[in-house]
């Protein structure tokens, strides 16, 4: 004959644990209901009747099953520079994400803490690493030959432009300028090799770097252990 | 568009038991908690307890707690309470309704009439 | 159990008039919800988390109020507004619903 299932509560047999969505509950010494997620524990078990569970209320949340007499607050409500990606329901906390053109500077277990904007580089400075959700953009001067004159989170170091005759030679943060005879070929706008030297190539002159500007937050973050990259802005 | 659909008016006698049935469609079921609220004629709204079909688990109110009980069955995607010992103070319209996880019942069934009369 | 109060219970109004029904709570509420509903039909989701408007409902409507004291607008009352308007409170276990405040025109 099978074994008898026996119903919450049940005192166990000694050195046996409870079974799956139980627990013991070590004043009634004896294995009782866990709530479900959407629920908390609004009375506990006795040796005679079991777990009461009710519903979380307004803005709490329990995600997993549990015994808890209260469920927990959903987090605050999303910042300005945040965008929610997961409303706060009976089970599962709110989710708040940085908006396009933010970064997470303090993130927490789920979402973001603290959103900042991302680095934007000055004209002369192009982005040499991207920013991502977590990362802020990384700036470098850009180099001979190539020109960026945006002030721009996006914007990569561009060629310039080969001229049959040069009117006004490129630098860092302009491109050069041809006389009225069209150039013999001009770079794709978002090309990233540069073309190798030519006689014609305009002379680049390199700008003295400048010092970086963090971001125009109302907070300071320790910046790590390496310097601010170069060519940034705050605006 | 999600649907609730219950099932006919009911006629008991004082003492009887009433189970009414509300079938959802368009949706996946045991994604939304199911809630039951009924309305006694010319009054207002009484939420008598919530079912969560994922887990089966159920929380009612204090004053019907041992007379109400709300069930599922996933497979036909159609929720069921069955009120016993029927009084003549639990006629009333009873309509399910879903709230999505979050505090306020956006899908309301067609309602049932329940009429305790002896 | 917290009760709501709605005021007033009945309102008559004109086209055009603009409306405000209370909601009072006994206790502190996060969020108030409205409901609407028209004699022989189920209530309608009307507003929730307290000023958001469900979908389909005029922009005519608003939602506002916080702690004990929630009120519904109706910026300019159209004839399709009569109905019965009930507030709604899930911040403390069982939720609860207002008396109902039954809107007339005039």
């Known amino acids: 004959l099978p074994a008898q299932v026996a119903f919450t509560p049940y005192a166990p047999e000694p050195g046996s644990t409870c079974r799956l969505r139980e627990y013991y509950d070590q004043t009634a010494q004896m294995c009782c209901s866990k709530c479900s997620p959407g629920q908390h524990a609004k009375v506990f078990c006795t040796k005679t009747s079991d777990t009461v569970c009710d519903s979380c209320e307004d803005s709490t949340y329990t995600q997993l099953w549990n015994w808890v007499p209260e469920c927990l607050s959903c987090g605050s409500r999303c910042s300005s520079d945040q965008v929610e990606t997961q409303a706060c329901t009976r089970e599962q906390n709110r989710i708040c994400t940085c908006r396009p053109g933010w970064y997470c500077a303090l993130s927490k277990q789920e979402g973001c803490r603290l959103c900042a904007p991302l680095r934007k580089c000055r004209p002369g400075f192009g982005v040499a690493r991207p920013g991502t959700e977590t990362s802020d953009v990384v700036c470098k001067p850009c180099a001979p030959g190539t020109f960026s004159n945006t002030t721009s989170s996006t914007d990569i170091c561009r060629p310039h432009q080969i001229c049959n005759v040069v009117a006004i030679p490129g630098n860092a943060s302009m491109d050069a300028v041809c006389t009225s005879t069209s150039p013999t070929r001009s770079m794709a706008p978002g090309a990233v090799h540069l073309p190798q030297p030519v006689s014609t190539r305009s002379q680049h002159t390199q700008p003295t770097p400048e010092p970086s500007t963090a971001p125009s937050t109302s907070f300071l973050l320790p910046m790590g252990p390496s310097p601010p990259a170069e060519g940034s802005t705050g605006d | 568009q999600v649907q609730l659909v219950q099932s006919g008016a009911e006629l008991k006698k004082p003492g009887a038991s009433v189970k009414v049935s509300c079938k959802a469609s368009?949706?996946?079921?045991?994604?939304?908690?199911m809630n039951w609220v009924r309305q006694a004629p010319g009054q207002s709204l009484e939420w008598m307890g919530i079912?969560?079909?994922?887990?089966?688990?159920?929380s009612y109110a204090q004053k019907l707690q041992g007379r109400v009980t709300l069930t599922t069955d996933t497979s036909t995607s159609t929720a069921y309470m069955e009120l016993r010992s029927l009084r003549s103070d639990d006629t009333a319209v009873y309509y399910c309704?879903?709230?999505?996880?979050?505090?306020?019942?956006?899908?309301w069934g067609t309602g049932t009439t329940v009429t305790v009369s002896s | 159990d917290i009760q709501l109060t709605q005021s007033p219970s009945f309102l008559s109004a004109s086209v055009g008039d603009r409306v405000t029904i209370t909601c009072r709570a006994s206790?502190?509420?996060?969020?108030m919800y409205w409901y609407q509903q028209k004699p022989g039909k189920a209530p309608k989701p009307w507003i929730y988390?307290?000023?958001n408007l469900a979908s389909g409902v005029p922009s005519r409507f608003s939602g506002s109020g916080s702690g004990t004291e929630y009120t519904l607008t109706i910026s300019s009352l159209q004839p399709e507004d009569a109905a019965t308007y009930y507030c709604?409170?899930?911040?403390?276990?069982?939720?609860?619903f207002g008396s109902g405040t039954k809107l007339e025109i005039k």
């Open positions: 079912i969560f079909p994922k887990y089966g688990t159920t």
């Open positions: 309704a879903t709230d999505g996880g979050t505090w306020y019942f956006d899908v």
């Open positions: 368009s949706y996946s079921f045991t994604d939304y908690n």
């Open positions: 988390l307290t000023s």
């Open positions: 709604q409170q899930w911040s403390s276990n069982p939720p609860t």
């Open positions: 206790s502190s509420v996060t969020y």
